[in-house]
């Protein structure tokens, strides 16, 4: 090999090791049966040299690097070439490095022909090997703006005092041109200003200088965005963190078009605006920080790009304004992502303010839009606490379980409304009384419907779930110990329709030591099942509940259980079953934890079913299904 | 296992020639640099030279060109060491090594004494 | 020739001490090696490529630098750490040692 180098042209070539391989055997360069490991060619030097090694690229790296001098004569501007060219270079890994000097009042711009760049943060690297390394300077401290790989938006970085840019290529790569071009331009006053352009739909990452370690202190930062008219813009901030000011605060300034607020500042911590039309400026504002405990500014922020949806145009007004202790999140709902570029799907509160989740609460009106492809991708949770403080103001006093009509109106899925039911311990229960009788979702007869309620105790220390029920069976309410949340669970788009059959109502009634009371009054058509609360967990541990069965006068009710025993086994107590005709108080009493359960029975009268459970040894829970059917009398027994 | 196996030590008379041997076993010399270090008398480490045995390149220290020649044999995968014009100032312990780049291997040396 | 120069040539530290010898480059050299030696032995590779510790070395030595100064690190002193300790580049032929630094327990 021979590199010669012009004189005057500002150029030095280095070769060095770079990471060896390390169970390889040593290469070195050889000139003129010298062996080294570095080889240093100043401008005005030829030098010819050799490799003691078959594949010097495992072993050795190229920097070839120019110093461009912009403070004692006038600038090179214009496009930049590779030189030496890279085919007269040892084809090793190779980094071109340009050292622009120049006075701090003169800008200095950074022009990148297609394709643009994409910024990459710590220990991400670039598909094709080619990265590029700049960096910017505020007196003699050396600020790193980034590395970028091609394909990506950054079209132009502007930068003042100075600028180092490194263009690393593989020593495979047939890359021969630098791809970019310096012009001056006034200064920038700031540290650097990056252009993104998107000509489509598409999204860019961003990193503020020097991440992930910190912004320099009190220096501004800009992005600026050119975005086609007719699409829409969002930004999120994926990472942050705020240094320890002592003067000033540190802040983003957006300069949106047709904003009559300009500039308009936010917190890093604030939601950041969403659905912008057109081009807008970003800024990062650093501050003083205090000097014995600085801390570190840093960003990392995402833009997205994409087209306005149809609802992005529609507001939505959602009045809690009457609501209390009530609180409607819309979020993204959970799938598993496939496509390349997914749009964002942004909601905003007043247009402006938007974000993939958003989280509205009683007491106020609030105007929503949707930046959205698919609305279908998102899904709304609700949860309001209805609570009673004084139960002789409570007692008898009821509530209707709705979801209002404004929540149901909103373009987006309504997945869960779940209502806290709260009352005084040991001076209230609560009963559920549903609009249309309903039936207990269990694997013999699953609930088909386009909602279910599901009922549990809200009581943080207790494990108790009451079961799922939907509209369309045979229980007539549901009597509840203490605190307890009915969540109404959509299953399907169809819940629009069918709003009508929901309907709840609750009403404070007195103290009850029984965990939960079901009032069955069965259709002659249909079989009823019924399952013990917490099935596949088992009940809870001295725990009682009890059906309230109603037979009507001309029928027969005949009661089967779906195993031969409970399969219980206590470690203190007994498990009991307690099967009571209600009109003559006969009753009949069965060990679960000894006995067979009982064979199907016929009952001609109202009669209950109560199940007590002991303290079971883990993994013998008492989990019990049983199924009640009305047949027509023969005989008039009375 | 790896291991480099001197020959045993040496008396000879000044002005003689010597020939120290290193035969490796566990890997091939051909895949590593085949170098000499020399060590006098409650001196310190002297590099003498390396050959590389894959194509018979050899390098020497300047100050003991046409004193030492390093040859190898990579059939018995062996390396040698030869000291001509023997004189006292040669009198030390020679060590055969093995390298790459992140991996050594050191012979227990052999002591060549020259005397009359 | 590049010329090594090692600092201190003695030294002595008590157990649990931290003890840092230095290796300077009379010109910039790629990475630093060290050996370790104790009498009456071959001399055993300690450290390669600046800061990498060879096999069976414990994990209180280390090695740092660039350029021209390099250095070996014991961040606590052992017994059995008592030895001579050469610095040696590979960045230049001929491939020169340092005249070593002999380490004592006090």
């Known amino acids: 090999f021979e590199i010669a180098l012009p004189r005057e042209s500002n150029i030095t070539v280095l070769i060095k090791l770079g990471t060896p391989t390390l169970l390889a055997k040593p290469c070195y360069i050889v000139i003129s049966k010298r062996h080294i490991t570095m080889l240093s060619i100043k401008s005005g030097e030829r030098i010819v040299f050799t490799f003691s090694c078959q594949s010097p690229e495992n072993h050795f790296v190229i920097e070839i690097q120019k110093n461009i001098d912009c403070m004692s004569g006038p600038c090179p501007f214009g496009e930049v070439q590779l030189q030496p060219s890279t085919s007269l270079l040892p084809t090793l890994n190779r980094t071109f490095i340009w050292d622009v000097k120049a006075h701090k009042s003169i800008g200095l711009e950074l022009q990148f022909s297609i394709p643009r760049l994409r910024q990459i943060g710590p220990g991400e690297s670039c598909p094709d090997g080619v990265t590029h390394s700049i960096s910017g300077r505020i007196d003699a401290t050396v600020v790193r703006i980034g590395t970028f790989c091609s394909n990506g938006t950054v079209s132009r970085i502007k930068m003042q005092e100075g600028v180092k840019m490194a263009l690393h290529l593989p020593w495979f790569h047939p890359r021969n041109v630098s791809g970019f071009s310096i012009a001056n331009r006034s200064s920038i006053k700031r540290l650097c200003i990056i252009e993104s352009v998107f000509e489509g739909e598409g999204s860019a990452t961003l990193m503020s200088a020097n991440y992930p370690e910190g912004f320099p202190e009190d220096e501004l930062m800009t992005w600026q965005f050119v975005v086609p008219a007719h699409l829409r813009a969002s930004v999120s901030f994926l990472n942050f963190n705020l240094s320890n000011c002592e003067r000033k605060e540190e802040r983003v300034e957006y300069y949106i078009p047709g904003s009559t607020t300009n500039p308009e500042v936010f917190k890093l911590e604030d939601k950041q605006p969403g659905n912008m039309a057109g081009n807008f400026n970003l800024s990062l504002q650093g501050c003083d920080q205090d000097a014995q405990s600085p801390g570190i500014l840093r960003l990392q922020f995402q833009v997205l790009v994409q087209h306005p949806q149809n609802e992005s145009n529609k507001i939505y007004v959602v009045d809690l304004s009457n609501e209390r202790a009530m609180s409607l999140t819309i979020e993204p709902r959970p799938v598993k992502q496939s496509r390349k570029f997914v749009p964002g799907c942004f909601v905003c509160l007043e247009s402006r303010t938007c974000s993939s989740n958003l989280t509205l609460t009683s007491g106020s009106k609030h105007k929503i839009s949707f930046l959205c492809d698919d609305l279908t991708r998102l899904w709304m949770n609700v949860e309001k606490t209805i609570s009673c403080t004084d139960h002789r103001y409570c007692q008898r006093k009821s509530y209707s379980l709705q979801v209002p009509s404004d929540i149901l109106h909103l373009p987006v899925e309504l997945h869960d409304f779940s209502w806290k039911l709260l009352v005084p311990k040991d001076r209230l229960s609560l009963v559920l009384v549903p609009a249309q009788k309903l039936q207990q979702h269990t694997h013999e007869k699953p609930c088909n419907t386009s909602f279910s309620y599901l009922v549990a105790s809200a009581i943080p220390s207790q494990d108790l779930y009451f079961g799922s029920f939907c509209p369309g069976g045979s229980i007539k309410q549901i009597q509840v110990k203490q605190n307890i949340s009915v969540t109404l669970r959509t299953f399907a788009p169809s819940f629009q329709q069918e709003a009508s059959r929901q309907g709840l109502t609750v009403s404070f009634i007195p103290y009850f030591k029984e965990e939960g009371v079901f009032t069955v009054t069965p259709d002659t058509k249909s079989k009823v099942y019924l399952r013990t609360p917490n099935w596949d967990r088992g009940l809870p541990s001295l725990t009682s509940v009890s059906w309230n069965i109603s037979v009507p006068r001309d029928q027969v009710a005949c009661l089967t259980f779906f195993k031969e025993r409970s399969g219980v086994v206590c470690q203190t107590g007994r498990a009991f079953m307690i099967i009571q005709e209600q009109r003559t108080r006969a009753e009949e009493i069965f060990s679960l934890d000894e006995d067979v359960l009982p064979k199907p029975s016929f009952h001609h009268h109202s009669f209950w079913v109560n199940i007590s459970n002991c303290s079971p040894t883990s993994g013998k829970q008492l989990d019990l299904l049983f199924s009640v059917t009305l047949t027509p009398r023969t005989v008039d027994l009375t | 296992e790896v291991q480099l196996k001197e020959s045993g030590a040496e008396l000879v008379r000044p002005g003689a020639l010597v020939k120290l041997s290193c035969k490796a076993s566990?890997?091939?010399?051909?895949?590593?640099?085949m170098y000499w270090v020399k060590q006098r008398p409650e001196q310190g480490l002297e590099w003498i030279g390396w050959?590389?045995?894959?194509?018979?390149?050899?390098i020497y220290d300047p100050k003991l060109q046409g004193k030492a020649r390093i040859t190898a044999d990579t059939s018995s995968n062996t390396a040698y060491l030869q000291l001509s014009s023997l004189t006292s100032e040669d009198t030390a312990v020679y060590y055969c090594a093995g390298r790459l780049y992140a991996m050594e291997y050191w012979g227990q040396g052999t002591t060549v004494t020259v005397s009359s | 020739d590049v010329v090594m120069t090692q600092t201190p040539a003695l030294m002595s530290a008590s157990p649990g001490e931290k003890v840092t010898m230095t290796c300077s480059a009379s010109s910039s050299v790629s990475y630093m090696y060290w050996y370790q030696q104790k009498p009456r032995s071959s001399p055993k590779p300690w450290i390669y490529?600046?800061?990498n510790l060879a096999s069976g070395v414990p994990a209180r030595f280390s090695g740092s630098g660039s350029g021209t100064s390099y250095s070996l690190t014991i961040s606590s002193m052992e017994a059995e750490d008592a030895a001579t300790y050469y610095c040696?580049?590979?960045?230049?032929?001929?491939?020169?040692f340092g005249g070593g630094t002999k380490l004592e327990i006090k």
């Open positions: 566990g890997f091939n010399i051909k895949d590593y640099y």
């Open positions: 490529l600046t800061s």
């Open positions: 040696q580049q590979w960045s230049s032929d001929p491939f020169t």
């Open positions: 050959i590389d045995p894959e194509n018979g390149n050899t």
